[in-house]
């Protein structure tokens, strides 16, 4: 129905008021819901109304505005403090102390975050995004620099339906369509063998407490586990000779031990230095990610930071010690 210049939508009635003609919805059931367009941002809940704009938003703090579009900083929030002396003594000892596992304590000086003291260093959101890993979407953290809000804005809860089967058949050069989904790691790219690779810039350099032979034996599971966290696919980089770049890692105390061995090299029966783990160089292949998602890592910097964030949360399933993003083609260094 219409009244004068005002055009009313389906199910609405025209009412003449003191301030002129207005549209009114006598029964919200019969009218187009203003909530249909999901106007409420940042997790606000939408309630249909009888008058324009036919919805009202109930905003979750710290947001306000008719569409919860405004961020309001809480009044003078005191900065989080660190258990100063206790944590100063514990920082950078190579073991994560939960009492110091906070942004204010640089995640125990990097001990809880794969040696990365600030995974959110490039995040310019007004929100402290490290505090918003909360199983709900926080759009202000949903950027690559803010680590995609830990993938909480795109159905993070989706799990691989045939997980055991898909794990057993991951990256086995046979396409299993039941595993060819983001949550199942796109079957390790088995179904995209004919597509061109789409490599992110840079290399992830990871130290893991598994000797090279064990890591290579378990490579498919390892790549699947990390790929699941990063919502993309990973592969072990090859050197100029085509060899997989997985090298023995001799641990943090290696410099002193090497020095000691140099002076005693000629002694008979000298044992070789013990391997503490592996240093593995990984590449990100986004060929499937870019088809299914706009949350793909264009370079390895944020991917490394996201792994550090998982270390902070304690959600890594492998004994990772450190992660670094290398921009240039690395020389083989130990």
């Amino acid at each position: 129905s219409s009244c004068g210049q005002v055009k009313c939508r389906k199910g609405e009635q025209c009412v003449h008021t003191a301030s002129g003609p207005r549209c009114f919805c006598p029964s919200p059931r019969d009218c187009e819901s203003g909530c249909a367009s999901s106007p409420c941002q940042h997790g606000g809940s939408c309630h249909p109304q009888r008058q324009p704009p036919y919805y009202s938003c109930q905003c979750a703090p710290p947001f306000s505005g008719s569409r919860c579009e405004l961020y309001t900083a809480p009044p003078s929030t005191p900065p989080a403090t660190c258990l100063s002396q206790y944590c100063a003594d514990k920082a950078r000892d190579g073991v994560c102390d939960e009492a110091c596992n906070s942004h204010a304590c640089q995640w125990d000086g990097g001990d809880c975050s794969l040696t990365m003291e600030n995974p959110w260093a490039n995040c310019s959101s007004p929100l402290p995004c490290w505090d918003y890993i909360n199983n709900q979407c926080d759009e202000l953290c949903n950027t690559v620099e803010c680590l995609f809000d830990n993938f909480e804005c795109q159905g993070n809860s989706k799990t691989c339906k045939y997980d055991k089967y898909c794990a057993d058949h991951f990256k086995d050069n046979h396409c299993d369509q039941g595993c060819n989904s983001e949550e199942c790691g796109w079957d390790g790219l088995d179904c995209a063998a004919d597509q061109p690779e789409n490599l992110a810039e840079g290399t992830l350099v990871i130290v893991v407490l598994m000797p090279p032979e064990q890591l290579l034996q378990d490579a498919r599971s390892f790549l699947r586990a990390l790929g699941t966290l990063l919502h993309t696919n990973l592969r072990i980089k090859r050197d100029s000779q085509g060899e997989l770049m997985v090298y023995p890692y001799y641990g943090e105390k290696s410099a002193a031990m090497k020095k000691q061995r140099m002076t005693r090299r000629s002694l008979p029966g000298e044992q070789e230095q013990e391997v503490a783990g592996s240093k593995v160089f990984l590449e990100i292949d986004n060929r499937q990610c870019v088809q299914d998602s706009d949350h793909c890592f264009k370079n390895t910097d944020a991917a490394a930071a996201l792994l550090a964030s998982h270390a902070i949360q304690g959600t890594l399933s492998y004994p990772l010690v450190s992660v670094v993003s290398e921009s240039l083609t690395p020389e083989r260094t130990q």
């Epitope: 073991v95 939960e98 004994p319």
Partner: antibody, heavy 122, light 107 residues
Framework: EVQLVESGGGLVQPGGSLRLSCAAS????????MSWVRQAPGKGLEWVSY????????YYADSVKGRFTISADTSKNTAYLQMNSLRAEDTAVYYC???????????????WGQGTLVTVSS | DIQMTQSPSSLSASVGDRVTITCRAS??????LAWYQQKPGKAPKLLIY???IRASGVPSRFSGSGSGTDFTLTISSLQPEDFATYYC?????????FGQGTKVEIK
């Protein structure tokens, strides 16, 4: 199967020394922290010391600081507790226990050895 | 150091009873609390970690709850093999400290 076996306990005079060993098997030794926990006869549990074999980080209870030294040999998958200047109040069953989280000191102890008795008496 | 106080220090119960043991920390330990069961002459056994997560192989009659300073271990239906001493332990701030123990005896 993950297993811890302690050895080295015995009778020692006050002021004496003893070295306890904890042989680990069934898991990657360097990836998990290890603690020593003791229990005096008829008493409760008391945490003594912790080591993370990979980094060599060590922690001690105040009651043993300066007298006890924890160490680990990753080539032998064994943790040690060197106990010096022993006192009568150190008499207890000593257990070694593995921490459940990789590199996380703040994790529960999920595997325990059978214990070894240390008696300090003249 | 953080003090852990368990109550009661002992209790008598019958098979099938519901048993509740409480543990209070002198300051917040968030959810970094474990419960252990110990039988005479044996090593402790981990039952619950992170305040409420059952360790592998632990029967579902054991449950844990709480966070901050107040925690509870509940045995929903006591079985003959559950008669033992139970300890809580905080592993938030070192030195890690145990409660004094709660002995569950047969009535």
């Amino acid at each position: 199967e993950v297993q811890l076996v302690e050895s080295g306990g015995g009778l020692v005079q006050p002021g004496g020394s003893l070295r306890l060993s904890c042989a680990a098997s069934g898991y990657t030794f360097s990836s998990y922290g290890m603690s020593w926990v003791r229990q005096a006869p008829g008493k409760g549990l008391e945490w003594v010391s912790y080591i993370y074999p990979y980094s060599g980080a060590t922690y001690y209870a105040d009651s043993v600081k300066g007298r006890f030294t924890i160490s680990a040999d990753t080539s032998k998958n064994t943790a040690y507790l060197q106990m010096n200047s022993l006192r009568a109040e150190d008499t207890a069953v000593y257990y070694c226990a593995r921490h459940s989280g990789y590199y996380r000191i703040s994790s529960a102890m999920d595997v325990w050895g059978q214990g070894t008795l240390v008696t300090v008496s003249s | 150091d953080i003090q852990m106080t368990q109550s009661p220090s002992s209790l008598s119960a019958s098979v099938g009873d519901r048993v509740t043991i409480t543990c209070r920390a002198s300051q917040s330990v968030r959810s970094f609390l474990a419960w252990y069961q110990q039988k005479p002459g044996k090593a402790p056994k981990l039952l619950i970690y992170r305040a409420s997560i059952r360790a592998s192989g632990v029967p579902s009659r054991f449950s844990g709850s709480g966070s901050g300073t107040d925690f509870t271990l509940t045995i929903s239906s006591l079985q003959p093999e559950d008669f033992a001493t139970y300890y809580c332990q905080q592993y938030y701030i070192s030195p890690w400290t145990f409660g004094q123990g709660t002995k569950v005896e047969i009535k």
